[in-house]
C-alpha cells in the first residue's frame, strides 16, 4: 500500500514527505533509505536530517524544498531505472515507537523518445526530452497504509490524484504530512 | 488503581511456542502503547516488543523478529505476547509494561517465568 | 540503537551515607526543541518487576522519596540516594526512550556496607 510516484530515466524523481514542526527551528531527525522502513531507522541510508542541518548524505540525493520548515521531500537527480523501488522517509520523533515512516514506491520509466522526422532522428536520440522541474507528474496511488498512532502527532493525507505532469510544484501536497506538538 | 495481571509462562521445548497475556485493569488499554520487556536469570532489562494504542502498529526487537507476536484485545483490556520457535536464550522473565505517553515505563506486570530446555 | 552504560556495576554504601550510580549513553538523547533529556531510572528489588523512580532525568515519580534525585545531559547521567536506606537495597537501571528500540543500562547493584 505503498504511496507510488513515476519518473522517466534522465529526470529528477520527487518523492514528497513533510512534517509540521511545532514551533520554527523545533526540527525533527528524518532519515530516507532506499528499501522499506523497518522496525528502527532506515535501511540503506542516503540522507539524514538531525535537528539543526542535513547531516549525512549521498551523490544525487538531496532536499530541494526548506527542510527546516519540515519540507524533507527527496529528489533524485537524473535517474535511472536502478533507482526504482520503495524508498522509505521516516520522521524520527522522539519516544518509545514514536517514528512516523512513510514507504513511496518510485517506478522509473524508459525515457520516451519523440519521433521525429528522419533526418533529424540522431539529433532527437542524442538529446532526448529532459525536464528539469523538481516533479516529474502525478502520483499514480493516493493510498497511505496504516500510520502509528502515537500521541504527539496528529496525521493527516492531503490532496487527490494529480492529474497534469505540468503541477509539479503541486506534487507537495500529495505528501503525507504530520503536525508535532 | 493500575493494574497488570500476567498469566501464560511456563517450561517448554526448544522450538516450541508459549502465549502470554496481560490483562489490565485500572485504565483503558486501548489508550495507551504497551510493550513487554525480558529479564534473563541474573540478567539486566531487555525490550522485546512493542504496540500502538490501536495495535496497528508493532515492533520487534531483531533478537525475537519472526518468531514473536505482540498483540492486544482492546475490548477484554489485554496484551497478548505470542512466542513461536523458541530458543533456550529466550528463557527469562518476562514482563508487560504499560508506557506512559509514548516515553517511559510507568507500570509494570509482576512478570511470569519463561523457560526454555529440553 | 543507542548503548546505555553504568557504573559500577555494584556499590555497597553505609546506611545514611550516599549513592551515586552513573549513566553514560553512547549518543545524546537530549532534544533541543524542548530542552527534555529522554532518560529514565528503575528500582528493582528481588523477585519484583522494576519500579520507575524517575523520568525526563530528574522528575520524580509519585511516592518516590526525596533522597532520590537525578540529574545530567546529554550523555552523562547521575542517580542520587543521598541518604542511602535499607529498603533502597536494590539493582539500579537507566534507560533511554529517546529513539530506536528503547534501551536499559545493565543495572547498578547497591548494598550496605
Known amino acids: 500500500s505503498e504511496v507510488e510516484y513515476r519518473a522517466e530515466v534522465g529526470q529528477n524523481a520527487y518523492l514528497p514527505c513533510f512534517y509540521t514542526p511545532a514551533a520554527p527551528g523545533n526540527l525533527v531527525p528524518v532519515c530516507w533509505g532506499k528499501g522499506a522502513c523497518p522496525v528502527f531507522e532506515c535501511a540503506n541510508v542516503v540522507l539524514r536530517t538531525d535537528e539543526r542541518d542535513v547531516n549525512y548524505w549521498t551523490s544525487r540525493y538531496w532536499l530541494n524544498g526548506d527542510f527546516r520548515k519540515g519540507d524533507v521531500s527527496l529528489t533524485i537527480e537524473n535517474v535511472t531505472l536502478a533507482d526504482s523501488g520503495i524508498y522509505c522517509c521516516r520522521i524520527q520523533i522522539p519516544g518509545i515507537m514514536n517514528d512516523e515512516k512513510f514507504n513511496l514506491k518510485l517506478v522509473i520509466k524508459p525515457a520516451k523518445v519523440t519521433p521525429a522526422p528522419t533526418r533529424q532522428r540522431d539529433f532527437t536520440a542524442a538529446f532526448p526530452r529532459m525536464l528539469t522541474t523538481r516533479g516529474h507528474g502525478p502520483a499514480e496511488t493516493q493510498t497511505l497504509g496504516s500510520l502509528p498512532d502515537i500521541n504527539l502527532t496528529q496525521i493527516s493525507t492531503l490532496a487527490n490524484e494529480l492529474r497534469d505532469s505540468r503541477l509539479a510544484n503541486d506534487l507537495r501536497d500529495s505528501g503525507a504530512t504530520i503536525r508535532i506538538g | 488503581q493500575v493494574q497488570l495481571q500476567q498469566s501464560g509462562g511456563g517450561l517448554v521445548q526448544p522450538g516450541g511456542s508459549l502465549r502470554l497475556s496481560c490483562a489490565a485493569s485500572?485504565?483503558?488499554?486501548?489508550?495507551?502503547?504497551m510493550s513487554w520487556v525480558r529479564q534473563a536469570p541474573g540478567k539486566g532489562l531487555e525490550w522485546v516488543s512493542g504496540?500502538?494504542?490501536?495495535?496497528?502498529?508493532?515492533y520487534n526487537a531483531d533478537s525475537v523478529k519472526g518468531r514473536f507476536t505482540i498483540s492486544r484485545d482492546n475490548s477484554k483490556n489485554t496484551l497478548f505476547l505470542q512466542m513461536n520457535s523458541l530458543r533456550a536464550e529466550d528463557t527469562a522473565v518476562y514482563y508487560c509494561a504499560k508506557i506512559f505517553g509514548s516515553y517511559y515505563f510507568d507500570y509494570w506486570g509482576q512478570g511470569t517465568l519463561v523457560t526454555v530446555s529440553s | 540503537e543507542i548503548v546505555m552504560t553504568q557504573s559500577p556495576d555494584s556499590l555497597a554504601v553505609s546506611l545514611g551515607e550516599r549513592a551515586t550510580i552513573n549513566c553514560k549513553s553512547s549518543q545524546s538523547v537530549l532534544y533541543s526543541s524542548n530542552n527534555k533529556n529522554y532518560l529514565a531510572w528503575y528500582q528493582q528489588k528481588p523477585g519484583q518487576p522494576p519500579k520507575l523512580l524517575i523520568y525526563?532525568?530528574?522528575t520524580r515519580e509519585s511516592g518516590v522519596p526525596n533522597r532520590f534525585s537525578g540529574s545530567g545531559s546529554g550523555t552523562d547521567f547521575t542517580l542520587t540516594i543521598s541518604s542511602l536506606q535499607a529498603e533502597d537495597v536494590a539493582v539500579y537501571y537507566c534507560?533511554?526512550?529517546?529513539?530506536?528500540?528503547?534501551?536499559f543500562g545493565q543495572g547498578t547493584k547497591v548494598e550496605i556496607k
Open positions: 485500572g485504565f483503558t488499554l486501548s489508550s495507551y502503547a
Open positions: 534507560q533511554q526512550y529517546y529513539s530506536g528500540p528503547p534501551t
Open positions: 525526563w532525568t530528574s
Open positions: 504496540i500502538s494504542g490501536s495495535g496497528g502498529s508493532t
